[in-house]
């Protein structure tokens, strides 16, 4: 708490300007009116204040708005936003995308802080869903934002928002998240032609089921190995050697380098060795010729 002391003669602030630049902590507290500060918040960002001075200004706003700042003040917080705690931010009602952008701009270059995470959470909850404009904004500032959401949170993303997602936005997504995003992407891009569709859907294929991979194998897509290695193992296992060959096209040669890694390793174990030999890559570990393969999972399903 800052001690309450009378403002020295001639030091009362008539406006927020650089005359306050070297005010001591107690002078700022005594000489700056909180209501004046609230109406001229935009000026604070044009004045280099020390962190101690910013703490005083924040304290004044906290006293004026104990239930949380109005959006007119929040939008102009600028550098002062970095002094806010998640608890402060939980009191806010931020509805304008412009306000969100202004505050994210302040935090640019920093990691996503607890303050920013709380701000985004408040904003998205207030909107009810992650619409395209919001997602556009968030992924522009934080490419990994989408992958920081739980599958439950991702379920509120409308398919139309998927158009805003760039491949790098999905780099850190795990299979559970891609399981949620893939059907949305499939829906979003459904009216595109084959090659264009593949370019757009490629980053989401870590959530694709077997039947969709089989369908892609009929379209000469030439999937690269990096994409193939990110596919769900359970979706790759039922694919035949011919289907994988068609799916990868000229990239099929890359299977040799990945034969010890999932999902290639597990897929090889499920294929007949003579089928693997047709690829001419020297892949080993398939089912020897003459062996009978029983699909016990199918038998259990029937019983």
């Amino acid at each position: 708490e800052v001690e309450k002391t009378a403002c020295p003669s001639g030091k009362k602030a008539r406006e927020i300007d650089e005359s306050l630049i070297f005010y001591k902590k107690w002078e700022l507290e005594a000489c700056v009116d909180a209501a004046l500060l609230a109406t001229q918040m935009d000026r604070v960002n044009a004045i280099p204040f020390t962190y101690e001075q910013l703490d005083v200004l924040k304290h004044k706003l906290d006293e004026l708005y104990p239930q949380g700042y109005p959006e007119s003040v929040i939008q102009h917080l600028g550098y002062l936003f970095l002094k806010m705690s998640p608890e402060d931010i939980r009191k806010w009602n931020v509805t304008s995308l412009e306000t969100l952008k202004a505050l994210l701009e302040v935090n640019k270059g920093h990691e996503m802080s607890p303050q920013v995470a709380t701000l985004i959470d408040r904003f998205v909850k207030g909107r009810g869903q992650l619409d395209k404009d919001t997602l556009d904004t968030l992924t522009a500032f934080y490419p990994g934002y989408l992958c920081s959401l739980s599958p439950e949170e991702l379920s509120s993303v409308p398919p139309s928002s998927i158009w805003a997602v760039r491949p790098q936005d999905l780099d850190t997504c795990d299979p559970r998240q891609l399981d949620v995003l893939y059907p949305k992407a499939r829906l979003a891009f459904q009216n595109m032609n084959g090659s264009e569709y593949f370019v757009k859907i490629q980053s989401f294929l870590g959530g694709a089921p077997t039947e969709d991979l089989k369908a892609l194998s009929q379209q000469n897509v030439s999937m690269d190995l990096a994409t193939f290695m990110k596919l769900r193992t359970d979706a790759v296992l039922p694919l035949t050697v011919a289907e994988v060959q068609k799916l990868l096209g000229p990239h099929v040669e890359g299977l040799k380098a990945e034969e010890r890694h999932r999902p290639v390793r597990d897929w090889i174990l499920r294929q007949r060795q003579d089928d693997l030999d047709t690829l001419g890559l020297g892949l080993q570990g398939g089912i020897p010729n003459g062996y009978l393969v029983l699909d016990l999972s199918m038998q259990e399903a029937l019983s």
Partner: antibody, heavy 119, light 106 residues
Framework: EVQLLESGGGLVQPGGSLRLSCAAS????????MSWVRQAPGKGLEWVSA????????YYADSVKGRFTISRDNSKNTLYLQMNSLRAEDTAVYYC????????????WGRGTLVTVSS | IQLTQSPSSLSASVGDRVTITCRAS??????LAWYQQKPGKAPKLLIY???SLESGVPSRFSGSGSGTDFTLTISSLQPEDFATYYC?????????FGGGTKVEIK
């Protein structure tokens, strides 16, 4: 090009005076607070003085208060440091530094000018 | 506020990971900057707000800490990194600098 260039350093006797200048270019000079920072030979950095963008507010380290005066001429994009009653302990390289727009770190420095106070 | 840097000097080889610490006599939040100074040259800003990398500074430099204890790390020392490093607080006036840490070639 964004730069700061100090001048006016030299040898002066104890009790004497000297005026340092710092010519700024490549940025809107009047929009930024400016500072003088000094470094005695073989020693660390010491903040000496600062001035607001318009020149209306100034600050001095206790070690120079009452002896040094900081000022600026925004029409000439120039910062000044008038040094009076100089002492041997004022011997240092004096750097002019631009203050960040939002808070008090220095994002641009001049190359410095040497002030030697000796009889 | 006094800033104490340690060590005051250190010897290291190219490729080494180097860590310099700066301790404040009282809490300063994240109001700390780091500068690099080479002999006969002006200081150059590396890090501000304790951990934000100044534009154009190589990513091998990083800063961390909050309150009273701060660290500057050079992940893989390069020949051009041999210099003296200073921390500076901007929590309150007067602004103060640490005493410096000289990084020399082993």
């Amino acid at each position: 090009e964004v730069q700061l260039l100090e001048s006016g350093g030299g040898l002066v006797q104890p009790g004497g005076s000297l005026r340092l200048s710092c010519a700024a270019s490549g940025f809107t000079f009047s929009s930024y607070a400016m500072s003088w920072v000094r470094q005695a030979p073989g020693k660390g950095l010491e903040w000496v003085s600062a001035i607001s963008g318009s020149g209306g507010s100034t600050y001095y380290a206790d070690s120079v208060k009452g002896r040094f005066t900081i000022s600026r001429d925004n029409s000439k994009n120039t910062l000044y440091l008038q040094m009076n009653s100089l002492r041997a302990e004022d011997t240092a390289v004096y750097y002019c530094a631009k203050v960040d727009r939002t808070t008090w770190y220095f994002d641009l420095w001049g190359r410095g000018t040497l002030v030697t106070v000796s009889s | 506020i006094q800033l104490t840097q340690s060590p005051s000097s250190l010897s290291a080889s190219v490729g080494d990971r180097v860590t310099i610490t700066c301790r404040a006599s009282q809490g300063i939040s994240s109001a700390l900057a780091w500068y690099q100074q080479k002999p006969g040259k002006a200081p150059k800003l590396l890090i501000y707000d304790a951990s934000s990398l100044e534009s154009g500074v190589p990513s091998r430099f990083s800063g961390s800490g909050s309150g009273t204890d701060f660290t500057l790390t050079i992940s893989s020392l390069q020949p051009e990194d041999f210099a003296t490093y200073y921390c500076q607080q901007f929590n309150n006036y007067p602004l103060t600098f640490g005493g410096g840490t000289k990084v020399e070639i082993k």
